[in-house]
């Protein structure tokens, strides 16, 4: 090879250590110190016998044909940085990687980057019970699902608890309650889903609401009214209260539903 006529241009390859779960993309960045006129960028993996196995070659915004398409090289807009990605990493992709640049004739020069290690771990949904280490970071979709399910469960539990408190603590109150039917069809979740009943909140009209609200006096029970929960399509007695078992599938009230189960 010709002796290099140009200044030595080191390559960097980062991160030095990268851990991804199987199925995720693993991306290294190979960076040139400067942008030569003409060069080829090679991406290598170190074999068990300490030889470099070429994964992909890149030149002038094109990648060598016929190579494994899981190994992708993409030039970034600054022209000096290149993303080297393994698409859907497999466990056996774990190993040592590096990049190399060949500065093309007339002044051929070959340059190699430092090495970097990739660890591809098994995909685990929950951490092992005996392991003290923290659970692997959940992917965005999974995290969203867990948060969503948790929120719904907490909401339903709170609603059940509140209903139970109201039903158990306060005496039957029939005065002022208005039983109003709803034309909305019951919600269906699927062909096999049990019938779900929505809660209909009667609109309660209280004269004292016209005035500016004041903090309730500690001993003024006459100022407090309670809504009665009525399930359409079932025989409703004037003094019927909802029990915890009758609230399966009940939807929490939305703001448009008017007053909820709170003391009014």
């Amino acid at each position: 090879l010709d002796s290099p006529d140009r200044p030595w241009s080191p390559l960097t390859f980062s991160p030095a250590q990268l851990t991804v779960q199987e199925g995720e993309n693993a991306t290294f960045t190979c960076s040139l110190a400067d942008i030569p006129d003409s060069f080829v960028l090679n991406w290598y993996r170190l074999s068990p016998r300490n030889q470099t196995d070429k994964l992909a070659a890149f030149q002038e915004d094109r990648i060598e044909p016929g190579r494994d398409r899981r190994f992708r090289v993409t030039r970034l807009p600054n022209g000096r940085d290149f993303h080297m990605s393994i698409v859907a990493a497999r466990l056996n992709d774990s190993g040592i990687y590096l990049c190399g640049a060949i500065y093309l004739p007339p002044n051929t020069q070959i340059n190699e980057s430092p090495r970097a290690e990739l660890s591809v771990t098994e995909r685990t949904l929950e951490p092992p019970t005996q392991s003290p280490s923290p659970p692997p970071r959940l992917s965005g979709q999974l995290q969203g699902l867990v948060i969503g399910v948790t929120s719904v469960l907490v909401g339903v539990l709170l609603l059940l608890l509140l209903t139970w408190v109201l039903a158990a603590v306060f005496p039957r109150a029939t005065r002022g309650a208005c039983v109003c039917g709803s034309e909305d069809e019951p919600l269906k979740e699927g062909p096999d889903a049990a019938p779900v009943f929505t809660l209909d909140y009667g609109e309660l009209d209280f004269q004292w609401r016209e005035k500016t609200p004041e903090p309730p006096a500690p001993c003024a029970p006459e100022q407090t009214e309670y809504a009665t929960i009525v399930f359409p399509g079932r025989p409703a007695s004037p003094g019927r209260r909802a029990s915890a078992s009758s609230l399966q599938g009940a939807q929490p009230p939305s703001p448009e539903d008017g007053p909820g189960l709170w003391p009014l």
């Epitope: 080829v40 470099t52 070429k54 030149q59 002038e60 915004d61 060598e64």
Partner: antibody, heavy 117, light 112 residues
Framework: ELTLQESGPGLVKPSQTLSLTCVVS?????????WNWIRQRPKRGLEWMGY?????HYNPAFQGRLSIDADTAQNHFSLQLSSMTTEDTAVYYC????????????WGQGILVTVSS | DIVMTQTPLSLSVSPGEPASIACKAS???????????LYWFRQKPGQSPQRLIY???NRDPGVPDRFSGSGSGTDFTLRITRVEADDAGVYYC?????????FGEGTKVELK
């Protein structure tokens, strides 16, 4: 100065397998470069056959009967072409390229292979 | 495969005279990166081919400036402004945009 030298039989019988070796001196056979075989049939143009660069890539016209390999310790690379016919009579060149396209910088002198019974 | 067609297949030129070889590709050799991958090779009698020009118009080191390449898309030309005795040989065009790489049949340049 890098030199490439082809060696092998000058005469092959039809249906036999051609084996050629390219010995490289003044440089190393490594997967940094592309080590090609190109042939030139009588009254025809140049025909790229394939290369080795740590892995192999072949011209589909030869797929199934062409094999290119390299021995980096011995500093040579080789060609095997099976099911030879008279149409395979040609001068065979080993060629180094610094990228995968026809950017060839060093050529062997070529070896004439005749297929005849 | 991309077919490369050269014309003429034979050319007889007097020393000092210009010479021109045409090469037509069956499809465009322009890549989306802006480069056109068209090459010219010369094979002197009894020798191996050597590349003269890469990417349409770039001369390889040591190639005299009497040689020039031009063209775009599918039509390309190699010109020798003043032919010398040393220029005799077979000239090939080749493409590097689509695998497999293919070459023209060659144009034989003889001196009168």
């Amino acid at each position: 100065e890098l030199t490439l030298q082809e060696s092998g039989p000058g005469l092959v019988k039809p249906s036999q397998t051609l084996s050629l070796t390219c010995v490289v001196s003044g440089g190393s056979v490594t997967n940094i470069f592309y080590w090609n075989w190109i042939r030139q049939r009588p009254k025809r143009g140049l025909e790229w056959m394939g290369y080795w660069s740590g892995y192999t890539h072949y011209n589909p016209a030869f797929q199934g009967r062409l094999s290119i390999d390299a021995d980096t310790a011995q500093n040579h690379f080789s060609l095997q072409l099976s099911s030879m016919t008279t149409e395979d009579t040609a001068v065979y060149y080993c060629v180094r390229g610094y990228i995968w396209t026809p950017d060839y910088d060093y050529w062997g002198q070529g070896i004439l292979v005749t297929v005849s019974s | 495969d991309i077919v490369m067609t050269q014309t003429p297949l034979s050319l007889s030129v007097s020393p000092g005279e210009p010479a021109s070889i045409a090469c037509k590709a069956s499809q465009s050799l322009l890549h989306s990166n802006g480069n056109t991958y068209l090459y010219w090779f010369r094979q002197k009698p009894g020798q191996s081919p050597q590349r003269l020009i890469y990417k349409v118009s770039n001369r390889d080191p040591g190639v005299p400036d009497r040689f020039s390449g031009s063209g775009s898309g599918t039509d390309f030309t190699l010109r020798i402004t003043r032919v010398e005795a040393d220029d005799a040989g077979v000239y090939y065009c080749g493409q590097g945009i689509q695998d497999p790489w293919t070459f023209g049949e060659g144009t034989k340049v003889e001196l009168k």
